[in-house]
Amino acid sequence: TTPEPCELDDEDFRCVCNFSEPQPDWSEAFQCVSAVEVEIHAGGLNLEPFLKRVDADADPRQYADTVKALRVRRLTVGAAQVPAQLLVGALRVLAYSRLKELTLEDLKITGTMPPLPLEATGLALSSLRLRNVSWATGRSWLAELQQWLKPGLKVLSIAQAHSPAFSCEQVRAFPALTSLDLSDNPGLGERGLMAALCPHKFPAIQNLALRNTGMETPTGVCAALAAAGVQPHSLDLSHNSLRATVNPSAPRCMWSSALNSLNLSFAGLEQVPKGLPAKLRVLDLSCNRLNRAPQPDELPEVDNLTLDGNPFLVPGTALPHEGSMNSGVVPAC
């Protein structure tokens, strides 16, 4: 017997649908109506024919009561080719729902997104995560998508982007955005970061994650942040092949005093990089290639230093640095 496409857990909390048939029975998803977390994977299907069966321009208010009854707070949609018109239709309807977190992954968005009609309500998301989503509209995709969202977005994550740089002049500010995650964009690099961090469009950023983004030096990242006027409290540069030395001709960069946590783990560092902030609450240098204990003058003033998993460290030995925090257990680096 063919397995049911949708599986609902026995407390009605999470519902996962895998529609892999060429002509799936979408009505199976109705069993997810009382789930709080819903995942729909479309098996790479092209949803273009779906447009013929639905009126994407219909007034979404006719569905308002039905949609308000949905309990979904977290929705993941993946593995499909989606016409922009259909995506917009879905966003318009979902604007009446309780949805707070939307994840789009492995999607190819075709065509252009129409502008938001005057009477339309934006989707009040707190979190938007995109992974491996390609847009026919190139660099303007964020601006086009943004107009369909209310301005209260707090978390934005963009991974494996085909175009991680944005058309900054079209993008409006994200006044409430406190977390921006651009991790897993290995082609981004420091120049790409400058292009992605549209100046003054991210005024409230507290957490910036740049894991595996092709960053080269902390100083280069510092310059990109300064140019964009982004002042995070926490910065994650782990899983980048960082150079410890700074180009002597590069201007010295002053880190924002707001930064208090810096993650440089898994960065292939053989020595503590130059140009770190003078003072930090947390500095993670674990799982690097440090062959000797860093000297106090090489390190910022730091309350919580992690050096686990470096070659110089024999498990259980303490370090000659005040306030250092080491478990004495070498993590799986």
Epitope: E7, L8, D10, E11, D12, S34, V36, R71, R73, R74
Partner: antibody
């Protein structure tokens, strides 16, 4: 409409045994975890036992106060939930409710309850 | 076991005023970005009725006068404005850790 109807309560002597039943309707019984919750007269609510669905191997869980004395079971073909209570104690005196989860809360739909009184 | 401490044990509020009930957990009830804390209302001779699920979500059919907030260990149920029909006992409950546990209850009265 979800309906849960408990039965089987009554007056029992300490150390006696009793089996409570809960007849369910209005939903796909077999897909849900189900619970028994009790409330002693004039006091608060206490979760008693839970049984998960077949896809979760009918795993059972019990409150420490009833472990090794009570057994929760289900019959998916009959849409029935049971609570076998052995070695009853006076502190087991309570209204016993059959409860179904929804949307991540374990206790969304409640029956009207069946009263168990344990007294010498 | 996660212990839930509700306060106050009883509460007297004037009609039209705000009632606030607190529930503190002995450890976090958050998991995967959700707070597995729920609120119930129980009137004499009736089973409990779900009001708020997952800390802040209003159960369908429940008046918008009821709201829930909080995360990790500190949660609040607010009734604003209080109506005569709200006289009942209110319970918080967690299902993040086995065994599932309830708070001791808060009895709401109208002055």
């Amino acid at each position: 409409e979800v309906q849960l109807v408990e039965s089987g309560g009554g007056l029992m002597q300490p150390k006696g045994s009793l089996k409570l039943s809960c007849a369910a309707s209005g939903f796909t019984f077999k897909t849900y975890a189900l619970n028994w919750v009790r409330q002693a007269p004039g006091t608060g609510l206490e979760w008693v036992a839970r049984i998960r669905s077949k896809s979760n191997n009918y795993t059972t869980y019990y409150a420490d106060s009833v472990k090794d004395r009570f057994t929760i079971s289900r019959d998916d073909s009959q849409n029935m939930l049971y609570l076998q209570m052995n070695n009853l104690k006076t502190e087991d005196t309570a209204m016993y409710y059959c409860v179904r989860p929804q949307s991540g809360t374990s206790f969304a739909y409640w029956g009207q309850g069946t009263l168990v009184t344990v007294s010498a | 076991n996660i212990v839930l401490t509700q306060s106050p044990a009883s509460l007297a509020v004037s009609l039209g005023q705000r009632a606030t009930i607190s529930c503190r957990a002995s450890e976090s009830v958050d998991s995967y970005g959700n707070s597995f804390m729920h609120w119930y209302q129980q009137k004499p001779g009736q089973p409990p009725k779900l009001l708020i699920y997952l800390a802040s979500n209003l159960e369908s059919g429940v008046p918008a006068r009821f709201s829930g907030s909080g995360s990790r260990t500190d949660f609040t149920l607010t009734i604003d404005p209080v109506e005569a029909d709200d006289v009942a006992t209110y319970y918080c409950q967690q299902n993040n850790g086995d065994p599932y546990t309830f708070g001791g209850g808060t009895k709401l009265e109208i002055i």
